[in-house]
Interface confidence: low
Amino acid sequence: ASTQSPSVFPLTRCCKNIPSNATSVTLGCLATGYFPEPVMVTWDTGSLNGTTMTLPATTLTLSGHYATISLLTVSGAWAKQMFTCRVAHTPSSTDWVDNKTFSVCSRDFTPPTVKILQSSCDGGGHFPPTIQLLCLVSGYTPGTINITWLEDGQVMDVDLSTASTTQEGELASTQSELTLSQKHWLSDRTYTCQVTYQGHTFEDSTKKCADSNPRGVSAYLSRPSPFDLFIRKSPTITCLVVDLAPSKGTVNLTWSRASGKPVNHSTRKEEKQRNGTLTVTSTLPVGTRDWIEGETYQCRVTHPHLPRALMRSTTKTSGPRAAPEVYAFATPEWPGSRDKRTLACLIQNFMPEDISVQWLHNEVQLPDARHSTTQPRKTKGSGFFVFSRLEVTRAEWEQKDEFICRAVHEAASPSQTVQRAVSVNPGLAGGSAQSQRAPDRVLCHSGQQQGLPRAAGGSVPHPRCHCGAGRADWPGPPELDVCVEEAEGEAPWTWTGLC
């Protein structure tokens, strides 16, 4: 075998598994995949004492390469200290060395969302003598965070003793307030709230910005539903314009494609709302292959009373893909409701968030109005989840006691569907699962409502739930309520239909 340098991995326990009164704790360093012997493992413990033990090298059967583990035991009081394991492999090179610096234990964590909110001006657009900026640090696994305010990148001398932290369920939120004089605010400086947490830095910035968006008029553009895309194979996208003032001028909605290719014929609908405003929708059929291959579609909204055109565009969601897991449950009989039962379907850990949910009985799809399905919410992992609820009658389950919950999602294989059968009386009829694999872990859910408008909300964990790995990003759905100057013209959005 040829010379191969080792891969080095820190070995730590989960912090929650180490008793607070532990007298000693052990951490390790794994050097693996090297050839030939030997490796030299040393520990840098700073000024702290510890005992080390390096285990004899073992041979990796398939490759003939070697692996070894070195263990360091230190006092339990030092559990929060950092230690460095230094691995040298002179056969690779006389100066080959790999350092790993880590603490005794590691935590799964959900990083924070950082957002600055600012006090509003009065109705006439005039700023008060002082302006308050509020830094919201939300949705993170409880732990030490440091908040710093910056003015044009320079650290400000701010009293942070007013920062307050609250905990809701498994996640924490902190807020810090900064008060500025009107003079400072109007000077066009940038203010940044910088948060340091678990070795990473997260921040948000704000500055006074011009009010350049046409007030009151909003446009949204939907993506095709997975059901229309993969099952019906006739996907459509819809451009929705709301809060238009009825007037003599005509609202024009024009469709185009980024590729420059022609678009299909669209259908248009106008609706007068109770509050006197006008809502206009235009629905455009799109090619299944065009959409899947990443074509971008644009909707342009013009009106004589708009200072400028509104442009919205949509395309297939990018990023990692993960197929949904589907679990279906029947609720037990409830006193006084012997002739009705509720079925529930949990669909989780899918990416991206676009999903269609259907219920079937007797091989026939039930109307969408029969079931109620939540908008996708982020899990504590990197995917999304939804719940769907179906009420069934005794007549239905006595005719055939098998109901199927089906999820349509682009990552599901082989046919973009995953389904699970459920029976009201499971002892009498067994439900079978198709395209269903047991999950590696079940995640405990909490999060915020995805869609419009944004709403707070938690969710009930699965009864057998245990917490899996934490998210390595900041959760949260898009919001429309932004300063267009900051968002560079086109605010992102997600359309979930009229409320």
């Epitope: 969302t113 950082v114 957002k115 910056l150 990148g153 940038t190 940044t192 910088q194 830095t201 997260f202 921040e203 948000d204 910035s205 990018s318 990023g319 944004r454 990003d473 900041w474 949260g476 759905p477 898009p478 919001e479 932004v482 900051e486 968002a487 560079e488 086109e490 605010a491 992102p492």
Partner: nanobody, 116 residues
């Protein structure tokens, strides 16, 4: 239309180097924190490196610290990931992610393969 486009991936030998680029369009780039993630086949997504918006503060995942460097050029709407001393376990699809407040965008990913 918001787009993130990664480039610079490819096949490289262990110990070699690659420089990934992520070009953004349709957003005010300087507002956004940039994160590189990677996902190896059959494994969960892993945070590689973060560079913040206003101050370009950087931080790294444990497995790449000391070998990878993240940077950004706001004038060119581009983020970079310089990857040195590459190892076979760095093989993955590398994704660029841009975040500002609750806005989040992903690139399509670029494949990096480290093999002799």
């Amino acid at each position: 239309d918001v787009q993130l486009q990664e480039s610079g991936g490819g096949l490289v030998q262990p110990g070699g180097s690659l420089r990934l680029s992520c070009v953004a369009s349709g957003i005010r780039f300087s507002n956004y924190g940039l994160t590189w993630y990677r996902q190896a086949p059959g494994k969960s997504r892993e945070l590689v490196a973060v560079i913040s918006s206003a101050t370009s503060t950087t931080s790294y995942g444990d497995s790449v610290r000391g070998r990878f460097t993240i940077s950004r050029d706001n004038a060119k709407n581009t983020a970079f990931l310089q990857m040195n001393s590459l190892k076979p376990e760095d093989t993955a699809v590398y994704y660029c992610n841009a975040r500002w407040r609750d806005y989040e965008y992903w690139g399509q990913g670029t494949q990096v393969t480290v093999s002799s």
